[in-house]
């Protein structure tokens, strides 16, 4: 049974996680973006399931393309600077939230979304669980 | 890591099929399409066509229409590119690439060397 | 079907210089060019996506820059291990088409 300084880590890593990406969700909002229509055009796979930490494999395996979608906002009119490290950031969370003994394979709901609904529904799914913890 | 790895070389003879394979790890299988392209000793890049492993829709560059086919196992994470009718002009090293909208073909496999002599 | 036209198809350059390759299309194609490095007996790597992005890995002496149908690919600085051939990829529509290669040799 998890501890409660294990569920504390839990909730800290997931509220870092959702800082991280409501990060990443502001700062392609920005107005100063001038990537933000192309970005949108790409289509990113959502899960079909997302209710457990260890659905966050499908999260993990859509990070690379996140990383080379923002990475085209790269430019010094955008503030969302160092994608890379970012990106290595979440995935470290990640893969201590979802645990590397089990490698599910991720099932991808059929619909695909844009990079704003993608991480909505990542942030959503760390809102839900945090309120489970706490 | 993400790998593509590839079947052997073979050698074929004129009017003869060649199969080759593609073996994805290290991501889902379904959410990239595979591309085929080829390269003639000293010759440049030729793209053959692409699959897409979720729904098995194919597309085929002209030149190869009628005698290529791109077929996949997703339950093994493997596609699969047959060339039939094969001719000397068809020698040639075949890569297998993944591909995904605009990100362009960021993983190819190692190539696998078809030769076509009688 | 859109064709792609490289120049120079080779180019003598010294370790050091900047170097400037050339893609054109025969039609518009916005940003969806990629560049590719190919040394002998390897398969391509991806140097160059979306005309200007660089993926992870890539040294930053690489870049990209155009759209619609003028592309160029600029090596800052030529290192020994950037001697091989370069190629540009169009990837806005099927069939997919590669400029026919510049090969990039050691003055």
């Known amino acids: 049974a998890p501890t409660s300084s294990s569920t504390k880590k839990t909730q800290l890593q997931l509220e870092h996680l959702l800082l991280d990406l409501q990060m990443i969700l502001n700062g392609i909002n920005n107005y100063k973006n001038p990537k933000l229509t192309r970005m949108l055009t790409f289509k990113f796979y959502m899960p079909k399931k997302a209710t457990e930490l260890r659905h966050l494999q499908c999260l993990e395996e859509e990070l690379k393309p996140l990383e080379e979608v923002l990475n085209l906002a790269q430019s010094k009119s955008f503030h969302l600077r160092d994608t890379k490290d970012l990106i290595s950031n979440i995935n470290v969370i990640v893969l201590e939230l979802k645990g590397s003994e089990t490698t599910l394979m991720c099932e991808y709901a059929d619909e695909t979304a844009t990079i704003v609904e993608f991480l909505n529904r990542w942030i959503t799914f760390c809102q839900s669980i945090i309120s489970t913890l706490t | 890591q993400v790998q593509l790895v590839q079947s052997g070389a073979e050698v074929k003879k004129p009017g003869a099929s060649v199969k080759v394979s593609c073996k994805a790890s290290?991501?889902?299988?379904?959410?990239?399409?595979i591309n085929w392209v080829r390269q003639a000793t000293g010759q440049g890049l030729e793209w053959m066509g692409w699959?897409?492993?979720?729904?098995?829709?194919?597309g085929y560059a002209q030149k190869f229409q009628g005698r290529v086919t791109m077929t996949r196992n997703t339950s093994i994470s493997t596609a699969y590119m047959e060339l039939s009718s094969l001719r000397s002009e068809d020698t040639a090293v075949y890569y297998c690439?993944?591909?995904?909208?605009?990100?362009?073909?960021?993983?190819w496999g190692q190539g696998t060397l078809v030769t076509v002599s009688s | 079907d859109i064709q792609m036209t490289q120049s120079p198809s080779s180019l003598s350059a010294s370790v050091g210089d900047r170097v400037t390759i050339t893609c054109r299309a025969s039609?518009?194609?916005?940003?969806?060019l990629g560049w590719y490095q190919q040394k002998p007996g390897k398969a391509p790597q991806r140097l160059i996506y979306?005309?200007?992005s660089l993926p992870s890995g890539v040294p930053s002496r690489f870049s990209g820059s155009g759209s619609g149908t003028e592309f160029t690919l600029t090596i800052s600085s030529l290192q020994p291990e950037d001697f091989a051939t370069y190629y540009c990829?169009?990837?806005?529509?099927?069939?997919?088409?590669f400029g026919q290669g510049t090969k990039l040799e050691i003055r």
């Open positions: 290290g991501y889902t299988f379904t959410t990239y399409d």
């Open positions: 690439a993944r591909g995904r909208q605009w990100l362009g073909f960021d993983y």
């Open positions: 039609q518009g194609i916005g940003d969806d």
């Open positions: 979306s005309a200007s």
């Open positions: 699959m897409n492993p979720n729904s098995g829709n194919t």
């Open positions: 990829l169009q990837h806005n529509s099927y069939p997919r088409s």
